[in-house]
């Protein structure tokens, strides 16, 4: 190899200034004896290399970009040979941000996977390789001391969330839990969380039925429509408030809204919808009166109110 | 402290009736599901029935279903279990207990002892 | 309903002895299986609940593990207080069924 090129820093904030040396052999004895040393920066050649000879013979070349404003490029130093350019040396130069602080970090049990999600905003394009890392510890009070540390977790690439596994997760006691993002550039923190998981735990919806008539009820009213649910079982035991949401199915109607439905209801008569007409329904339950997230809408049921009787 | 005391057990003939009683302090009662569980000699535990915080939700074993009433006084802090039609196989020690969100018995009273026989 | 088989039945033990019991599911329960230990004449004590969360005031040396169908109860340690039964109870759903318990014995 007849050149080398070192550089100031290989990555740097975009925009800033970058100086880089490349420095050709004395054997390189096909070459001029004062051989001129051009700089390129992709294909672009770039003026304003100083050029010296050293002391050990050497040539050596110094540049100076202003700024560098491509995300990604290649310098290189070259000599003219011939009619052509001979490239002695490049390096990749990378241009970026230090990440950004990851922001609205949010989390939620799922207690089917029996694993804590937390998902979070990564902020602006770096323009750099960033890794993010979700780091939590135990914490027997509200997060000021911290306890036992949980094994981080890294989500795949690109991913802006990431799974802690139950056997990390100790219930009904708090966990501080933040984010960290760092490329070559800096590194960043997210403000820290200071959750029990068990506050945070999303449910499964019931699942929304008709209610089977029995032969002493009386058959409902026209406009209304006899509901019931049956809950999601492994979530039983955990007191929680629910709603319903209907509508039309033709039309352009939006949903409405009706709710809390009577606390440990899991029957429900459903009054002033027009008669005649199909209905969509959907219900949703939260943890309540406990923190918790509300469940996503169950699957819909399809329903259609009686005639009203002829006068 | 959390604490539950059951009573209301005893002797009684076969296709009798008994009412157990638990009462609990220590704890908002009315937050939380209670449910009883039974142990026949030597035997294991064998749930029997729970019920919901406010006492609408009360799903039973099948072995005591249409002959248990599970019930509950949230103003006295009490739990019931009416037991009728009592047959041999429900001579066991029943424990009164709070039921967890994620369905664990945590703490448990001392027990009652009911033994059917003629 | 969802059967729940613990094995084994019996075991003796040596203080200082690691113990291993394991109840398995007759269907996926995820993480709803709970442990207890009961003494002769006493009601049972929670140990472990969701699998592997410890209640509190329980020794370490007791620790859960497993999920879906497969669960495991390790003591790390026998101590003498630690001679009982030990039942494992599924949660997921109604009817609430419990193992037919392990009677640990000392050897």
């Known amino acids: 190899e007849c050149g080398h090129i070192s550089v100031s820093a290989p990555i740097v904030h975009l925009g800033d200034p970058i100086t880089a040396s490349c420095i050709i052999k004395q054997n390189c004895s096909h070459l001029d004896p004062e051989p001129q040393i051009l700089w390129r920066l992709g294909a672009e050649l770039q003026p304003g290399g100083r050029q010296q000879r050293l002391s050990d013979g050497t040539q050596e070349s110094i540049i100076t970009l202003p700024h560098l404003n491509h995300t990604q490029a290649f310098l290189s130093c070259a000599l003219n040979w011939g009619n052509s350019l001979q490239i002695l040396d490049q390096v990749e130069l990378r241009a970026g941000y230090p990440p950004a602080i990851p922001h609205n970090l949010s989390c939620l049990m799922n207690l089917t996977t029996s694993s804590l999600i937390c998902q979070w905003e990564p902020g602006p394009e770096t323009h750099l390789p960033t890794s993010f890392t979700l780091k939590s510890f135990k914490s027997r009070g509200n997060c000021q001391t911290q306890g036992d540390s949980i094994l981080d977790c890294v989500p795949k690439d690109g991913q802006s969330h990431c799974s802690i596994p139950r056997k990390h997760l100790l219930l009904y006691q708090n966990m501080g839990i933040w984010v960290q993002a760092e490329n070559a550039l800096g590194t960043s923190m997210s403000p820290q969380l200071c959750l029990d998981p068990m506050d945070v735990v999303k449910l499964e919806p019931p699942m929304l039925r008709t209610m089977d008539p029995s032969p002493e009820a009386a058959p409902p009213q026209a406009g209304c429509l006899q509901l019931s649910w049956e809950p999601w079982q492994p979530g039983l035991h955990i007191n929680q408030k629910c709603e319903l949401r209907h509508k039309p199915q033709r039309g352009e109607a939006s949903w409405a809204l009706v709710g809390p439905l009577p606390l440990e209801a899991l029957q429900y008569e459903l009054c002033g919808l027009l008669p005649a007409t199909a209905y969509t329904l959907q219900i949703r339950c939260i943890r309540w009166p406990l923190p918790g997230h509300w469940s996503d809408w169950s699957p819909s049921l399809e329903l259609r109110t009686t005639e009203r009787a002829p006068t | 402290e959390v604490q539950l005391l059951e009573s209301g057990g005893g002797l009684v003939q076969p296709g009798g009736s008994l009412r157990l009683s638990c009462a609990a302090s220590?704890?908002?009662?009315?937050?939380?599901?209670m449910g009883w569980v039974r142990q026949a000699p030597g035997k294991g535990l064998e749930w029997v029935s729970s019920i919901s915080s406010s006492g609408g939700v009360t799903p039973y074993a099948d072995s005591v279903k249409g002959r248990f009433t599970i019930s509950r006084d949230n103003s006295k802090n009490t739990l019931y279990l009416q037991m009728n039609s009592l047959r041999a196989e429900d001579t066991a020690v029943y424990y009164c207990?709070?039921?967890?969100?994620?369905?664990?018995?945590?703490?448990w009273g001392q027990g009652t002892l009911v033994t059917v026989s003629s | 309903d969802i059967q729940m088989t613990q094995s084994p039945s019996a075991l003796s033990a040596s203080v200082g002895d690691r113990v291993t019991i394991t109840c398995r599911a007759s269907?996926?329960?995820?993480?709803?299986l709970n442990w207890y230990q009961q003494k002769p004449g006493k009601a049972p004590k929670l140990l472990i609940y969701?699998?592997?969360n410890l209640q509190n005031g329980i020794p370490s040396r007791f620790s859960g593990s497993g999920s879906g169908t497969d669960f495991t109860l390790t003591i790390s340690s026998l101590q003498p207080e630690d001679f009982a039964t030990y039942h494992c109870q599924q949660s997921y759903s109604t009817p609430l069924t419990f193992g037919g318990g392990t009677n640990v014995e000392i050897r």
């Open positions: 220590g704890f908002t009662f009315s937050l939380y599901w």
């Open positions: 969701y699998a592997s």
């Open positions: 269907q996926g329960i995820s993480s709803y």
């Open positions: 207990a709070m039921l967890g969100e994620l369905g664990w018995f945590d703490p």
